[in-house]
């Protein structure tokens, strides 16, 4: 069956060192447990996180994301997932693409992460 992939319509903001969550869902919602779900970073398609055959595929991850990501799957039965990235870095700023693949059918959605420095401040006057 066909579906759309929907991500946040506005940039998500995070502070360096914090964790951030990138949500993604399919519409109409359906059980995505058996689908391939992932996030990559354009333009070079570096894998941020990949879920396939009911398991997270750590071996396919780009080194800079190894050990820093977690796929929240408590709503995967409704076609809703969230990528949690820990210890956010400045290099995480920019575009991410989430995709769902069901057999040969694949759709994706782009989203943007803005990373800010928690210690940046402007002195008054």
């Amino acid at each position: 069956g066909q579906f759309r992939v929907i991500g946040p319509r506005h940039p998500i903001r995070a502070l360096v060192g914090d964790e951030v969550e990138l949500p993604c869902r399919i519409s109409p919602g359906k059980n995505a447990t058996g689908m391939e779900v992932g996030w990559y970073r354009p333009p070079f398609s570096r894998v941020v996180h990949l879920y396939r055959n009911g398991k997270d595929q750590d071996g396919d991850q780009a080194p800079e994301y190894r050990g820093r990501t977690e796929l929240l799957k408590d709503a995967i039965g409704e076609g809703k997932v969230t990528l949690r990235i820990r210890n956010v870095r400045f290099s995480d700023e920019g575009g991410f693409t989430c995709f769902f693949r069901d057999h040969s059918y694949q759709e994706e959605a782009a989203m943007e992460l803005k990373v800010e420095d928690p210690f940046y401040w402007v002195s008054p006057g």
Epitope: R4, I6, E21, P23, S27, P28, K80
Partner: antibody
Framework: QVQLVQSGAEVKKPGSSVKVSCKAS????????ISWVRQAPGQGLEWMGG????????NYAQKFQGRVTITADKSTSTAYMELSSLRSEDTAVYYC?????????????WGQGTTVTVSS | DIQMTQSPSTLSASVGDRVTITCRAS??????LAWYQQKPGKAPKLLIY???SLESGVPSRFSGSGSGTEFTLTISSLQPDDFATYYC?????????FGQGTKVEIK
Amino acid sequence: QVQLVQSGAEVKKPGSSVKVSCKASGGTFSSYAISWVRQAPGQGLEWMGGIIPIFGTANYAQKFQGRVTITADKSTSTAYMELSSLRSEDTAVYYCARGWYFFDAGFDYWGQGTTVTVSS
Amino acid sequence: DIQMTQSPSTLSASVGDRVTITCRASQSISSWLAWYQQKPGKAPKLLIYDASSLESGVPSRFSGSGSGTEFTLTISSLQPDDFATYYCQQYDSPLLTFGQGTKVEIK
């Protein structure tokens, strides 16, 4: 199974404040948006505002700006709605409702409702 | 705020009828629209989201269509359990708004 359980009915005097709680179970609380919707007797649904616990910031309908405060405690998976300067027109059933991030995709789970009566 | 206007306000129908409720937005909301059913003394129940996606567990006699500013909820064959009030709600803007409701009553 996701459940939203709200605090009990309240009777308040005009000018006072009320704080209603909404405890969530059966899901990743921080990852969803919790909204507050009220319904005056015989009237329609009115969105008051909402919060995304992971981000902590709330947004409010213009009508309630400055009079309503919505907060969330991630440690207890509980959202709160406080309405101040109560008047008789605030007599209503107050519901909490859960939506996907950024108040997206409608409200799939609702609390049972909390009746707030404002009377002198 | 985006205004949502439903029509009609009240609709009298019989079991087996095809029923259509319209919801108009004051500006384009793409397909970011949900429909709810509410019965007296109960919390609303989500029927449709993203204008046309049927919520899990909702009977297939309910369907939604439309995009931009004009949307419809259709009940293909009205059942006794469907007599209730129906609301549309937009989530294009982070300041959410509901329509005023349409009461479907027995003719």
